[in-house]
Interface confidence: low
């Protein structure tokens, strides 16, 4: 009896997710089964299904399959969170690259290499042909999408809509060209799912044909999604277990990215004189083990043979014979030149003191002249003289070049939040340095908080309790989704940027998040025409202690009648007491049968001193906070809409003056709410928007 192949590896899994059809014309088919594998086999073979199966949901509670002729990218469909559901989408329909000749390509590219629109396969105009969908069942000759039904050289093609050009190939890249990694691919989270010899990878959540210990639930930070190549164990490059019972594992062919910079995650703090943590970032020149035995060169195989070579462990700085920790050992080590002692630890290297000695700055640090040259995320600063062009782009005076020596942390642009530096990493062009204000330094960076000096206008889930429903123009309001469920609010301040709170990100995996714009209902009901769903491409954390995050969208939002941006206030401005403002949010509202609509609660600005009195003197507000009290008792933000805005109007201009963050109580009578004061961080926000690259629409 021939063993039926297990086809679940051909599907992308989204846990705790289902698809809901909004378009009633869409068909679905259901059946009781025991496992998701059974659903997959039937979907792949289209056995007994009256349509081409593109995805299925396995209902774990009811042991039921729901097969779909659509996927999450189809129109008339929406994703929904559900504990008992797992969504599996056929990778062929969501891939935007080809494997081999692209015979299995089922994506939606419909333009040829020279930019001509494709002719629909079911049409004979302008070109008559024999490639009818009915003649090529299973080849998905749908619409006018590029296909390669016969597996010909050149890859997917189509008949063109230009009568002069009968057919042309489409410019769809090979998956191996699209996929790239940095260093040895430990941070690679791409979609390569086959090995360099073409073997299909085994799913990480499966134990057949190879039993292994890399279980996704055990290692949630290793990116063990579906059957994609990964490097969880410090190998020279990503690999996977294979579906071939005779080949336990194999490396994957993933090229090194042209711009081979370290990813912004998991970057060790580089040190040269001492060891930070386990010393994975140690880049000093100690070259003997603890007892003085010299180290063997990393590029030598004598006296000890090994695979810890500079070629295998790129980015680990395996130069000369210096002590290093390329593999996550407890501290830096090396192979020794003594044939009888293979390896030894370099435990004589001292541990770093994180406080950087007595390093601190006064005021905003514009006169700081220390020699720290590392950002708070552990990136090494790049030389100031290489970055003067960028610096001139965002300051309007000539910086004091005498202060900008080497790559030391400095504050040439009068940044309110202390010394910083450029990094040389295109993802994080610059960042603050881990230096604190000197103890006892009370120099304010902004003065006269409670007295208007500068006008603000230019020419547990935080939820709004007891607010009234709103449908006015609130197009800047963002629902941040975590695993398909609303978790936080946010404000669209620029097409590619959302201002929100750092408490909104329980997971480091950006794939867990989406931004919904243009909605009024938290579930998107009735908002289909105006809703925009955007992925998140980067989180930029605010200055130390700010609780702010600028969330970069994977592509810019399209501004229209339903989606708009909201203005930022002038830096350091104050808004007069008793100014009427509003907070916005979704979530629990104090009502039993909550309708899921966006709520607004009206508050008024209160001076910091008065605010402190209302909090029985237990809270001292600083220059980075703003206070607003409810006009209606028990009305205001509550656990669930962290990240949402406090919006005020001045000179007929609406601005986001505050951001809701946790920890200040929930709509308690006579207790005003305390928000992050956006005006205090306005320069930082503008600087990020100006200096960080965003995708073009």
């Amino acid at each position: 009896q021939r063993k039926r192949r297990n086809t679940i590896h051909e599907f992308k899994k989204s846990a705790k997710t289902t698809l809901i059809k909004i378009d009633p014309a869409l068909k679905i088919k259901t059946k009781k089964v025991n496992t998701a594998d059974q659903c997959a086999n039937r979907c792949t073979r289209n056995k007994g299904l009256p349509f081409t199966c593109k995805a299925f949901v396995f209902d774990k509670a009811r042991k039921q399959c729901l097969w779909f002729p659509f996927n999450s990218m189809s129109s008339g469909v929406k994703k929904e969170f559900g504990h008992e559901f797992d969504l599996y989408e056929n990778k062929d329909y969501i891939r935007n690259c080809i494997i081999g000749k692209g015979r299995s390509y089922k994506g939606t590219v419909s333009i040829t290499k020279s930019g001509i629109k494709c002719q629909p396969w079911s049409s004979m105009i302008p070109h008559e042909h024999s490639f009818l969908p009915s003649s090529y069942r299973g080849k998905d000759l749908q619409e006018n999408y590029c296909r390669n039904p016969r597996g010909e050289e050149g890859g997917p093609w189509c008949f063109t809509s230009n009568p002069e050009v009968r057919y042309e190939v489409c410019d769809i890249p090979q998956c191996s060209e699209v996929e790239c990694m940095t260093c040895n691919g430990e941070s690679y989270r791409g979609l390569m799912d086959h090995t360099e010899s073409g073997k299909i990878c085994q799913r990480w959540d499966h134990q057949t044909p190879h039993r292994h210990k890399f279980l996704p639930e055990r290692y949630p930070d290793k990116g063990f999604d579906d059957n994609y190549c990964r490097n969880p164990d410090g190998q020279p490059r990503p690999w996977c277990y294979t579906l071939d019972p005779h080949t336990r594992w194999e490396y994957c062919a993933i090229k090194t990215c042209a711009d081979n910079t370290m990813n912004d995650t998991d970057v060790p703090l580089e040190t040269t004189e001492c060891i930070q943590g386990q010393g994975e970032g140690y880049r000093g020149t100690v070259n003997t083990i603890w007892n003085g035995i010299p180290c063997q060169r990393w590029d030598s195989q004598y006296p000890h043979e090994h695979d810890m070579t500079p070629e295998n462990f790129k980015c680990k700085d395996l130069r000369e014979n210096y002590c290093r920790n390329p593999d996550g050992s407890e501290s830096p080590w090396c192979f020794t030149t003594d044939p009888n002692i293979r390896v030894g630890y370099c435990s004589q290297i001292p541990n770093c003191d994180m406080s950087h000695g007595q390093d601190c700055y006064r005021g905003n640090g514009k006169n700081y002249m220390g020699n720290l040259s590392q950002t708070r995320s552990g990136l090494t600063c790049s030389m100031w003289d290489k970055n003067m062009e960028d610096l001139h782009r965002h300051i309007f005076w000539e910086p004091d070049a005498s202060k900008l020596n080497e790559n030391y942390c400095r504050n040439p642009d009068d940044d309110a939040h202390g010394p910083w530096c450029y990094t040389g990493n295109p993802l994080i062009p610059w960042d603050y340095c881990p230096i604190s204000r000197c103890e006892g330094d009370t120099t304010p960076t902004i003065v006269n908080l409670d007295h208007p000096v500068i006008s603000c206008a230019k020419t547990k889930q935080l939820r709004v309790v007891n607010g009234i429903p709103t449908r006015t123009n609130i197009g800047w309001m963002v629902s941040l989704r975590y695993r398909n469920k609303h978790i936080c609010g946010g404000s669209l301040i620029k097409e590619s940027w959302v201002l929100t709170a750092r408490q909104c990100f329980p997971s480091r995996d950006l794939k867990d998040y989406e931004a919904w714009l243009g909605i009024h209902d938290v579930h998107g009901r009735g908002d289909e025409k105006c809703k925009q769903v955007l992925n998140v491409s980067q989180l930029v954390y605010g200055p130390e202690g700010s609780d702010l995050v600028l969330m970069k969208l994977a592509r810019p939002a399209v501004l229209d009648d339903f989606v708009s941006t909201i203005d930022l206030p002038n830096y350091g401005c104050t808004i007069p007491e008793k100014t009427s403002c509003s907070v916005y949010g979704w979530g629990y509202t104090g009502l039993i049968n909550y309708d899921g609509l966006l709520r607004v609660a009206h508050l008024y600005i209160m001076g910091n001193e008065k605010c402190s009195q209302h909090h029985r003197g237990k809270v001292t507000l600083n220059e980075s906070e703003i206070c607003a009290g409810a006009e209606k008792i028990g009305s205001g933000p509550c656990e669930g809409d962290y990240g949402g805005p406090l919006v005020c109007e001045q000179h007929k201009m609406r601005m986001v003056l505050g951001v809701i963050v946790p920890g200040r109580g929930c709509a308690i009578p006579n207790r005003p709410g305390i928000f992050v004061r956006v005006a205090y961080y306005a320069k930082w926000i503008h600087k990020i928007i100006l200096t960080y690259k965003v995708p073009q629409s």
């Epitope: 044909p209 292994h212 890399f214 336990r248 594992w249």
Partner: antibody
Framework: VEESGGRLVPPGTPLTLTCTVS????????MGWVRQAPGKGLEYIGM?????STYYADWAKGRLTISKTPTTVDLEITSPTTEDTATYFC????????????????WGQGTLVTVSS | QVLTQTPSPVSAAVGGTVTINCQAS????????FSWYQQKPGQPPKLLIY???TLASGVPSRFKGSGSGTQFTLTISGVQCGDAATYYC?????????????FGGGTEVVVK
Amino acid sequence: VEESGGRLVPPGTPLTLTCTVSGIDLSSYAMGWVRQAPGKGLEYIGMIDVSGSTYYADWAKGRLTISKTPTTVDLEITSPTTEDTATYFCARLIDERSTYSYAFDLWGQGTLVTVSS
Amino acid sequence: QVLTQTPSPVSAAVGGTVTINCQASQSFYNNGAFSWYQQKPGQPPKLLIYDASTLASGVPSRFKGSGSGTQFTLTISGVQCGDAATYYCQGEFSCGSADCVAFGGGTEVVVK
């Protein structure tokens, strides 16, 4: 789990030990071999997983071979030396999907192999 | 790869506490993929602990495993006469992308 086949053999004479299992589905459990020289500690030899793939300790590669049938797991010592004198245990690997330890949770009583001329 | 167990032998009074350490030569071991066994004379080993700290089925809670990285510990509290045995630690490391297993040299526990 029950081992058999242990006996006195002269050096260089191939020997096959058999581990017979009952109540264990070898298509669901990996099995391993561990040996213990008289008065000494435990030494890992290798294992065979559900698909029949085999894994060996570095010292055992080429010297010992593990194979299986639906109800038995065999260990062949291709060319025994006096250093191979030991009690050989067959053991089942724990199969809790939530674990990543290759721990042996069910052991046979062992079979004694003596290599001597 | 070497697993070094200390001390050996170790003696304990009934009702007392015994601590056995197991040191891995390098932390190439998959963190936490560690097991402990008890072996009495003439018997096969018996699994006590896996995943560094998870008690195997039927093992009394007097046995406790802890540790990570390169240093692991087995603690037996309220020692009983029946605990006299040799205790072995077992760790795993990566041989390429296959998995290899190593045992410690054993620690004999004598109960007085």
